[in-house]
């Protein structure tokens, strides 16, 4: 399987909400011995390998924001910790998973990474990630709502296995 990022750039006005999205593509094993760990984190723009560094999102680590479930099951973070920070991560039946950030500030600008880890019990893990940039703007040229820029096909299906 691989991870696609439908949009590589989100440009939003401060105060707005945004939902960053990744999509799980390809055959997904739905066996009982397979679970998926999905999460989000910030990263610096690595010149060698994007998303190699894991930084918190609004002080919440990737462990705080994770979803853990089987196959294409739906899930979302309901814990108060994330919501108190204006964050919610979610996953649907179609392989889409997202993080919603509320009341954006200029501090939220940066590179965001989604991470999927396929965990096969008694076997190895398979990790893939996707990256996208969020620019929060202020002033007269800031859009009234978030504007999204599609990834190129090459970028949107960028596989990084670890």
């Amino acid at each position: 399987f691989k991870v696609a990022t439908p949009y590589s750039l989100y440009v939003c006005p401060e105060g707005q909400n945004v939902t960053l999205t990744c999509r799980l593509l390809g055959p997904v094993d739905k066996g009982h011995d397979v679970t998926f760990y999905k999460t989000w984190y910030r990263s610096s723009r690595g010149e060698v390998q994007t998303c190699s560094e894991r930084r918190p999102i609004r002080n919440l680590t990737f462990q705080d924001l994770h979803l853990h479930h089987g196959g294409h099951q739906a899930a979302n973070t309901s814990h108060d910790l994330a919501q108190r920070h204006g964050l919610e991560s979610a996953s649907d039946h179609h392989g889409n998973f997202s993080i919603t950030m509320r009341n954006l500030t200029l501090l939220d600008s940066g590179l965001y990474c989604c991470l999927v880890v396929e965990i096969r019990h008694h076997h190895s893990e398979h990790r893939v990630h996707g990256a996208m940039e969020l620019q929060v703007q202020t002033g007269k040229d800031a859009p009234s709502n978030c504007v999204v820029y599609p990834s190129s096909s090459q970028d949107s299906e960028n596989i990084t296995a670890a």
């Epitope: 401060e14 105060g15 610096s44 723009r45 690595g46 010149e47 200029l106 501090l107 600008s109 940066g110 620019q135 703007q137 202020t138 002033g139 007269k140 040229d141 800031a142």
Partner: antibody
Framework: QSVEESGGRLVTPGTPLTLTCTAS????????MTWVRQAPGKGLEYIGI?????YTYYASWATGRFTISKTSTTVDLKIPSPTAEDAATYFC?????????????????WGPGTLVTVSS | DVVMTQTPASVSEPVGGTVTIKCQAS??????LAWYQQKPGQPPKLLIY???TLASGVPSRFEGSRSGTEFTLTISDLECADAATYYC??????????FGGGTEVVVK
């Protein structure tokens, strides 16, 4: 369009000081504004920014040492307890290039600066 | 914080010569970098933004470029009026709007 700083003077250590940046020819609700300082013979040092929406953000070293606020026509920089290290020329600048408010394009419109001297 | 390391601290070249100033970011900041020129007693003047875009009115003798996390300001066909201190400036994040240490350019 222009910006001009005022309020710089000689103060004794610990005496609160407020610097004011007055904007002319444009609206502060359209642009983020920033404060930068420069000690005599030294380089430029970023202090913080106030967004068009009125949110304030500070360089890590400046948090707690300065307060930025604004009205419809002015942006203030408050130095609650100046020390000798705070002696510098303080510049106010509009963020963005030319008429653009894009915060990634640098600081385009600068004031001439106002000098703060701290001495007992 | 992103640290901007600017070199050299000072450079001296004759009229008509070429000066190269480098700025190294401690981490990737994409192309979010600006260059300023400052003359004594004056505020800085924006020369280049987004690493390589010339501000209006700036002569094409000034050129900005990027290679990874290293940024370069090149001034060719030096003129006496180019004598000033030049600063790079990370514009990637409002927390990291940090400046380089500056480079004094002396035109002989």
């Amino acid at each position: 369009q222009s910006v001009e700083e005022s309020g710089g003077r000689l103060v004794t250590p610990g005496t609160p000081l407020t610097l004011t940046c007055t904007a002319s020819g444009f609206s502060l609700s359209d642009y983020a504004m920033t404060w930068v300082r420069q000690a005599p013979g030294k380089g430029l040092e970023y202090i913080g920014i106030i967004s068009a929406g009125g949110y304030t953000y500070y360089a890590s070293w400046a948090t707690g040492r300065f307060t930025i606020s604004k009205t419809s026509t002015t942006v203030d920089l408050k130095i609650p307890s100046p020390t000798a290290e705070d002696a510098a020329t303080y510049f106010c600048a509009r963020v963005g290039y030319a008429d653009s408010s894009d915060i990634y394009k640098g600081f385009y419109l600068w004031g001439p600066g106002t000098l703060v001297t701290v001495s007992s | 914080d992103v640290v901007m390391t600017q070199t050299p601290a000072s450079v001296s070249e004759p009229v008509g010569g070429t000066v190269t100033i480098k700025c190294q970011a401690s981490e990737s900041i994409s192309n979010y970098l600006a260059w300023y020129q400052q003359k004594p007693g004056q505020p800085p003047k924006l020369l280049i933004y987004l690493a390589s875009t010339l501000a209006s009115g700036v002569p094409s003798r000034f050129e900005g470029s990027r290679s990874g996390t290293e940024f370069t300001l090149t001034i060719s066909d030096l003129e006496c009026a180019d004598a000033a201190t030049y600063y790079c400036h990370c514009t990637d994040s409002i927390i990291n709007y940090n400046f380089g240490g500056g480079t004094e350019v002396v035109v002989k």
